[in-house]
Interface confidence: low
């Protein structure tokens, strides 16, 4: 629990916080778990312990191995352990997985990519940031503060992105670079003309008088969220609540529904003791979206009532 | 209650331009469309422009394409469509219309723009 994995690049700056953590104030001491020998504090050497932290300026492979950090206050003493890796410098583009951090998914909206670990150095700006690679140019790549914006991410954006900066400890410049996967999700989906799933076109809906019909406007305007999306109905062209008519009402509030990943509008017109003139409306269910508006037309025929006789 | 007011509409020769302006009122802010629809007496109404006001990016019908631009004021929720060149064919009723991921959309009264010599 109290372990933490760690790696870097020789001939770059490695730091590694200690797994347990305490106050500023207290004293951390830090051993070379194999031989139980303490790391020296003093900042002349290549490997030194400062507070909760322990620097490999630069590391080398013969660092690799476990080291423990015991966070000692007044009353108690916690032990953690950081588990270092140093790796040779690979000699071609490919970064190995056992190299990367976690990845990062982007999207149009939000394409942050941030350098892992930057936090634990003393580094200045510009950051510098490859992907597989390739050094990043063009304009819609940002370097800011810590992390990368990428404009306008498309999915051709999905890559390895390793940032580069420089650490300075006490006036000597070390390299350090990080890499993470950045994949890139579609958030927003996409939109599409309106389909009206019901009623069919020109339906003819039987309806008994003195009863109450129900009418349902069902469509459909594309995957995701949909932004600017609307079902109604209409009498005659007006719009319900312009038509003065308080026994035909629209159910307040429209249905999201999601019909194979597809999202989907309902609205429902009541109509409350059918009246002979309700037969000679035209019921227009409208949808509309960005792309435009699709109309379906019913109107509505007398039930014959059942003839019981033999 | 979420109430637009839009303005700038009137008449005005081929080739002219107009401003039309939508003030929002009655919501908290967060991700949201504004844009704008036109009905053109006897037509279906039909889709203008957009603009997402969380990133900015716009969308309009290819008829109004390279003519018309949208833009918002977010300070202000106030969104404007700026209509150059005009033909007689742009005459409408032009409706501002709001909508967020998770209601609306929400119309306003519109405002007529006229387009002939």
């Known amino acids: 629990k109290f372990s933490k994995q760690s790696w870097g690049l020789e001939n770059e700056a490695l730091i590694v916080r200690c797994p347990r953590q305490g106050k500023p104030s207290y004293t951390v001491d830090w051993y070379y778990s194999q031989t139980n020998k303490s790391i020296p504090t003093q900042e002349r050497n290549r490997v030194f312990a400062s507070g909760q932290l322990l620097k490999f300026l630069p590391a080398a492979v013969a660092d690799s191995g476990i080291y423990t950090c015991i966070v000692r206050s007044p009353t108690f003493n916690r032990t953690g352990y950081a588990n270092v890796t140093i790796y040779k410098k690979q000699s071609d583009c490919n970064v190995p997985d056992y190299l990367m951090y976690s990845t990062v998914s982007g999207s149009e909206k939000n394409s942050k990519i941030y350098c892992p670990t930057i936090d634990l150095y003393n580094w200045t700006a510009p950051l510098e940031w490859f992907k597989n690679c390739q050094a990043l140019q063009g304009s819609r790549y940002r370097a800011h503060k810590s992390f990368l914006v990428i404009d306008n991410v498309m999915t051709e954006d999905a890559g390895d992105y390793t940032c580069k900066f420089i650490h300075n400890e006490n006036g000597a410049n070390y390299s350090v670079t990080a890499t993470r996967s950045f994949t890139v999700k579609d958030e927003q989906g996409f939109s599409l003309f309106p389909v009206i799933g019901a009623p069919a076109q020109n339906e003819i809906k039987e309806v008994e008088i003195g009863k109450n019909a129900n009418l349902t406007c069902s469509a459909c305007f594309g995957k995701g969220t949909q932004f600017l999306a609307a079902v109604l109905w209409q009498l005659n062209g007006t719009k319900i609540t312009d038509f003065g008519e308080p026994r035909i009402q629209q159910e307040e509030g429209q249905n999201q529904s999601f019909s194979n990943g597809l999202a989907c509008l309902d609205m429902v017109l009541r109509i409350a003791d059918v009246k002979e003139e309700d037969l000679l409306l035209q019921y227009d269910c409208l949808a509309l979206n960005l792309h435009g508006l699709r109309r379906h037309t019913v109107r509505l025929s007398r039930k014959n009532p059942i003839d019981h006789h033999s | 209650e979420v109430q637009l007011v839009e303005s700038g509409g009137g008449l005005v020769q081929p080739g002219g331009s107009l401003r039309l302006s939508c003030a929002a009122s009655?919501?908290?802010?967060?991700?949201?469309?504004m844009g704008w629809f036109r009905q053109a007496p006897g037509k279906e109404r039909e889709f203008v422009a957009v603009?997402?006001?969380?990133?900015?990016?716009?969308y309009y019908a290819d008829s109004v394409k390279g003519r018309f631009t949208i833009s918002a004021d977010n300070s202000k929720n106030t969104a404007y469509l700026q209509m150059n060149s005009l033909k007689p064919e742009d005459t409408a009723v032009y409706y501002c219309v709001v909508s967020f991921s998770t209601r609306g959309p929400y119309w306003g009264q519109g405002t007529l723009v006229t387009v002939s010599s």
């Open positions: 009655g919501f908290t802010l967060g991700d949201y469309v």
């Open positions: 603009i997402y006001t969380s990133d900015g990016s716009t």
